[in-house]
Every structure is written in structure tokens, then in C-alpha cells.
């Protein structure tokens, strides 16, 4: 399966929407900066098959969807932008699910890299813990928004490789 061109466009639109969502200057939140330990190794795409890479991307997008569809998130971000954001994430999840179905039976390796999925979940668990610790303050959400933008940018490299990979 080759991810469609529309998937890359959707990823770019997601980044643009997230950029528009920013309400406060990141400079006013410097004291709240935090290292969430983004699992870069899971997105290098060297150590696993295509189906496994797709499952890792799917997990990241699903967790992002979960994070931004909470009550606390709805109270923080512009509703119109959030709806656009959900639409783009939903589109990407559908693309990846369609791709995963095509990969069934194509490779001998398992469709899921369990370690990688769990690692991505722990990454989002740290983000949720941070928000709770910071009582979902505007600055905490700003730090999280910047972090998710960064993680989407980094995962875009893997998505591009998947789009080109035979």
C-alpha cells in the first residue's frame, strides 16, 4: 500500500491548524517547558516493516485525537479550529487503516510492533500527566500544542518515506 498524496496534504493542514490554534505567546510560557521524551527512534522507520510503521503512525494520531477531544481541550481551544483538526486527524486515521488492511498477509512480520505502540502510549501518558500536574493551565496547553506540532513534523518524515516506499 502506498499512502495517497492527500495524506501528506492532510498532515500539512494539521500542522497549519495547530499553528493557528496558538493563543498565547510561547515566550510567556518558557518556565513551563518540558521534555516529554518523544520516542524519535520509533519514527526513524529503519527497524521495522511497512505495516508496523503504519501501526505506529496510527497510534500517534489516535492518541493525539484522544488528547484533543477531552473536555479540558474543548474549553481551551477555538471550537471551529478543533473541528477542522478532528476532520484532518480522522482522514489520516482512515488512510492508515485502509493501508493496514492492504498489508494483511503481504509480509511475514507481525502487523504491529508491540514495543513501539506501548512506547507511543507512554509518551502520551507523560503528556497527560504533565497537563494534570499543571492543572490544564493555558501555558501547559501551549507547551503541549508545541510538542504535538513537533512530533507531527518528526513523524512526517516517516510518512514521506512510506509514501515513496515500494
Amino acid at each position: 500500500c502506498d499512502l495517497p498524496q492527500t495524506h501528506s496534504l492532510s498532515n500539512r493542514r494539521t500542522l497549519m491548524i495547530m499553528a493557528q490554534m496558538g493563543r498565547i505567546s510561547p515566550f510567556s510560557c518558557l518556565k513551563d517547558r518540558h521534555d516529554f521524551g518523544f520516542p524519535q527512534e520509533e519514527f526513524d522507520g529503519n527497524q521495522f516493516q511497512k505495516a508496523q510503521a503504519i501501526s505506529v503512525l496510527h497510534e500517534m494520531i489516535q492518541q493525539t485525537f484522544n488528547l484533543f477531544s477531552t473536555k479540558d481541550s474543548s474549553a481551551t481551544w477555538d471550537e471551529t479550529l478543533l473541528d477542522k483538526f478532528y476532520t484532518e486527524l480522522y482522514q489520516q486515521l482512515n488512510d492508515l487503516e485502509a493501508c493496514m488492511m492492504q498489508e494483511v498477509g503481504v509480509e511475514d512480520t507481525p502487523l504491529m510492533n508491540v514495543d513501539s505502540i506501548l512506547t507511543v502510549r507512554k509518551y502520551f501518558q507523560r503528556i497527560t500527566l504533565y497537563l494534570t500536574e499543571k492543572k490544564y493551565s493555558p501555558c501547559a496547553w501551549e507547551v503541549v500544542r508545541a510538542e504535538i506540532m513537533r512530533s507531527f513534523s518528526l513523524s512526517a518524515n516517516l510518512q514521506e518515506r512510506l509514501r515513496r516506499k515500494e
Epitope: D35, F48, L118, R126, Y130
Partner: antibody, heavy 122, light 107 residues
Framework: EMQLMESGGGLVQPGGSLRLSCVAS????????MSWVRQAPGKGLEWVAS????????YYAPSVKGRFSISRDNSNNTLYVQMNSLGVEDTAFYYC???????????????WGQGTLVIVST | DIRVTQSPSSLSASVGDRVSISCQTS??????LNWYQQRPGKGPQLLIS???TLQSGVPSRFSGSGSGTDFILTIISLQPEDSASYYC?????????FGQGTKVEIK
């Protein structure tokens, strides 16, 4: 009884290579992440590398990245570390360690081997 | 990387004394801070995980507290067998980092 037994340590010249092994027993090896932690004689502890329960996720300390490679064989309950381009600063006791979870981070190192000494010297 | 700072580097106390060791991290690690004991010539042993969870078989005189960036290991009544080095370690993100250690001696 849960046990971790390291082997493969010894004297090696700078620039040389060495492969350490660790055989696990007494617990379900394939269910836990594993790590290597080292300790230079008379010094503190330094985490070296971790591998997820299925061998899929691998993490390295900046000081060893690109030189060391961690791997595991779940069918033989064995953890490995391949160490290349060794320098004198790699001289240490190397401990094989079981983690409390299936993947690295947000857990603890709850079981340690007795350690194997690696000496890098001319 | 998260820096872990432990203090004091060494201490000497009498049997029965209350002893505290402090550990600070350069950013919040929530509760993901672990404590280890290493007796001379032995491998380390996990005493406390997740800031305050005592491992099975560890005497109840050991306790851990704290969250975020500040943590404390307390030995309520020091015993001769507690003569050892103690290390804290953040398990929040890789690379895992350890404190430099505290050597506890019995007077």
C-alpha cells in the same frame, strides 16, 4: 528463583570489540524490557541501553550511541550487548538489568545481575 | 537529558539515627523516581519505585516521598546492615539518569 547471569567480560584493547551476554531465569523473560547499566570501578551508575520486551524498541545513552548495539533472543532468554570502538572510558562493571515493564521509561530497574568486568587497556 | 542531583555525597550516622537523602531532578518526573541500595562488592538492589512504593522484602524502616522535582529517601532507624551507597534514578524518560550516589557509613 529469579536470576540474571552476565558473561563475556574481559580485557580488550582500545578500538576493540566485545560482546556481553546475559542469561535470565526464574521469570517470563519475553514480558519485560531489559537494560544494561555500567559502573566504573569506585564510581556511580550509568545507564547504557534498553530494549523492549519484543526487541522492537531500542534506546541508548548518548555516550555509547553508534558504538553499542543491544539485542535479545527471547527463545533462549538471553540479552546481548555488542560493544565496538571501545575506549578506556568504557572500562566498568556491566550489569544486566530487568525492568518492571514491557518497554523502557516510566518504570524501575527491579532486578540486577552480579555484573561482568570489562577492562579497556593497552 | 534530565539531570539528577543527590545530596549529601556521604554521611556518617549512629545506629538508631534517622537519616535522610535528598534527590532533585532538573525537570518534573512526576513520581517516576526510584531508589537503589548498593552494598560493597554487590550489584544494586531496588528499594523504592515510583517515589514511595517499597519493594517486597525491603524493611519498613525505609521510606520514600516526593513528586515533581524533589524527593527524599528516609531511613527511620539506621541499622548496621544499611551501610551502603544509595542512588536515586529518574525512570521518566530515556536516557535514564542516576544521582551521583550517597555513601552511608555507621559511626
Amino acid at each position: 528463583e529469579m536470576q540474571l547471569m552476565e558473561s563475556g567480560g574481559g580485557l580488550v584493547q582500545p578500538g576493540g570489540s566485545l560482546r556481553l551476554s546475559c542469561v535470565a531465569s526464574g521469570f517470563t523473560f519475553k514480558s519485560f524490557a531489559m537494560s544494561w547499566v555500567r559502573q566504573a570501578p569506585g564510581k556511580g551508575l550509568e545507564w547504557v541501553a534498553s530494549v523492549g520486551s519484543q526487541g522492537g524498541s531500542k534506546y541508548y545513552a548518548p555516550s555509547v550511541k553508534g558504538r553499542f548495539s543491544i539485542s535479545r533472543d527471547n527463545s533462549n532468554n538471553t540479552l546481548y550487548v555488542q560493544m565496538n570502538s571501545l575506549g578506556v572510558e568504557d572500562t566498568a562493571f556491566y550489569y544486566c538489568v530487568k525492568e518492571t515493564d514491557a518497554v523502557a521509561t516510566m518504570d524501575a530497574l527491579d532486578m540486577w545481575g552480579q555484573g561482568t568486568l570489562v577492562i579497556v587497556s593497552t | 537529558d534530565i539531570r539528577v542531583t543527590q545530596s549529601p555525597s556521604s554521611l556518617s550516622a549512629s545506629v538508631g539515627d534517622r537519616v535522610s537523602i535528598s534527590c532533585q531532578t532538573s525537570q518534573s518526573v512526576n513520581i517516576y523516581l526510584n531508589w537503589y541500595q548498593q552494598r560493597p562488592g554487590k550489584g544494586p538492589q531496588l528499594l523504592i519505585s515510583a517515589a514511595s512504593t517499597l519493594q517486597s522484602g525491603v524493611p519498613s524502616r525505609f521510606s520514600g516521598s516526593g513528586s515533581g522535582t524533589d524527593f527524599i529517601l528516609t531511613i527511620i532507624s539506621l541499622q548496621p546492615e544499611d551501610s551502603a551507597s544509595y542512588y536515586c534514578q529518574q525512570g521518566y524518560i530515556t536516557p535514564y539518569t542516576f544521582g551521583q550516589g550517597t555513601k552511608v557509613e555507621i559511626k
